[in-house]
């Protein structure tokens, strides 16, 4: 019965960008300005999102799609559809409740967002530290001490970091 009723529902013919207007014998009316319907068969249009304050408009609203926001400089998007803007920090920092704080020794952050992560523990891969880590950069692991025996012809490129962990100090 439900299936049959939905097939006979005149509102199901209303395409995206319109709504089924009960005040006008359920004819399909265009969404009013500043509103949209992204699917067919809608009984109302949704009000467009305003991208202001810490947000700014990435894409304006249309009758069939909501506005898309991004964040003003110094902030970055979080959440589905950029539902929040979070303050950027510098590389080598992470955002805490008290603001941006430097990464603790043994951790790094090479982005303006996210948390400080531990340096790679080269010894877990049987390798040695080729380049020390900093607040902004992970350590670079080099060949294992055995590979550096006399007669070794070249230094092999560092393997990609696999497992986080503290490097030996």
């Amino acid at each position: 019965f439900e299936r049959t009723r939905s097939l006979q529902d005149p509102c199901s013919n209303c395409p995206a960008g319109t709504f089924c207007d009960n005040n006008r014998n359920q004819i399909c009316s265009p969404c009013p300005p500043n509103s949209f319907s992204s699917a067919g068969g809608q009984r109302t249009c949704d009000i467009c999102r305003q991208c202001k304050g810490v947000f700014r408009t990435r894409k304006e609203c249309s009758s069939t799609s909501n506005a898309e926001c991004d964040c003003t400089p110094g902030f970055h998007c979080l959440g589905a559809g950029c539902s929040m803007c979070e303050q950027d920090c510098k590389q080598g920092q992470e955002l805490t409740k008290k603001g941006c704080k430097d990464c603790c020794f043994g951790t790094f952050n090479d982005q303006k967002r996210g948390i400080c992560r531990p340096w790679t523990n080269c010894s877990l891969d049987g390798k040695s530290v080729l380049v020390n880590g900093t607040k902004e950069r992970d350590v670079v692991c080099g060949p294992s001490p055995a590979d550096l025996s006399p007669g070794a012809s070249s230094v092999t490129p560092p393997a990609p970091a696999r497992e986080p962990g503290h490097s030996p100090q």
């Epitope: 408009t57 990435r58 894409k59 304006e60 991004d70 400089p73």
Partner: antibody, heavy 115, light 107 residues
């Protein structure tokens, strides 16, 4: 950083023409609507034109005071907004601002219509 | 067209005092109202959007409120740098319209 820089203002005689430009940077221009707002000397602000983006078929809107005389247009490849002003009247004298998203304004370009 | 009426063209104010600037819309604007501050020789600066939301970087002494079609900008503890002209604007319905402006003058 968002920047809107208007150019093209100047002195023009009544019934003359002028084309204003606005160079936009620091945001995604081609998916955003843009406005022109003007201000006569010592007077208030007046919205005069709006152009929407491709997703809205570049729809244009005008204040009654400039309809059929002014034309708003855009060049998305250059992130440029334009205002072609024809049949200028003395009452069109003022500072013309390019505006995006209510929050962002250029420094304005001065148009003087005088014999 | 929707008319935006700012009943006071001028307000005589005291530094450190509280100021309210009012604006009335002739029709429903769904709170799509902006308040701007403008100083001589400068472009307008957005203070409030959506009738009540403070724009980034604007001091918290500025606030906006709405009641029906009546809108208010409030400045608590007025500072010398707040002496300017304030405009409301509706951006709900084209043509977008501004109020006539309210100029603050020091007593």
């Amino acid at each position: 950083e968002v920047q809107l820089v208007e150019t093209g203002g100047g002195l023009v005689q009544p019934n003359g023409s002028l084309k204003l430009s606005c160079a936009a940077s620091g945001f995604i221009f081609n998916t955003n609507a843009m406005n022109w707002v003007r201000q006569a000397p010592g007077k208030g602000l007046e919205w005069i034109a709006r152009i929407r983006s491709k997703i809205n078929n570049y729809a244009t809107y005008y204040a009654d005071s400039v309809k059929d005389r002014f034309t708003i247009s855009r060049d998305d490849s250059q992130s440029m907004l334009y205002l072609q002003m024809n049949n200028l009247k003395t009452e069109d004298t003022g500072m013309y601002y390019c505006n995006w998203d209510e929050a962002y304004w250029g420094q304005g370009t001065l148009v003087t219509v005088s014999a | 067209d929707i008319q935006m009426t700012q009943s006071s063209s001028y307000l005589s104010v005291s530094l450190g005092g509280r100021v309210t600037v009012t604006c009335k819309a002739s029709d429903h604007i769904n709170n799509w109202l902006a308040w701007y501050q403008q100083k001589p020789g400068n472009a307008p600066r957005l203070l409030i959007f959506g009738a009540t939301s403070l724009e980034t970087g604007v001091p918290s002494r500025f606030s906006g409120s709405a009641s029906g079609n009546d809108y208010t900008l409030t400045i608590t503890s007025l500072q010398t740098e707040d002496v300017a002209t304030y405009y409301c604007q509706q951006y709900w319905s084209i043509p977008y319209t501004f109020g006539g402006g309210t100029k603050l003058e020091i007593k």
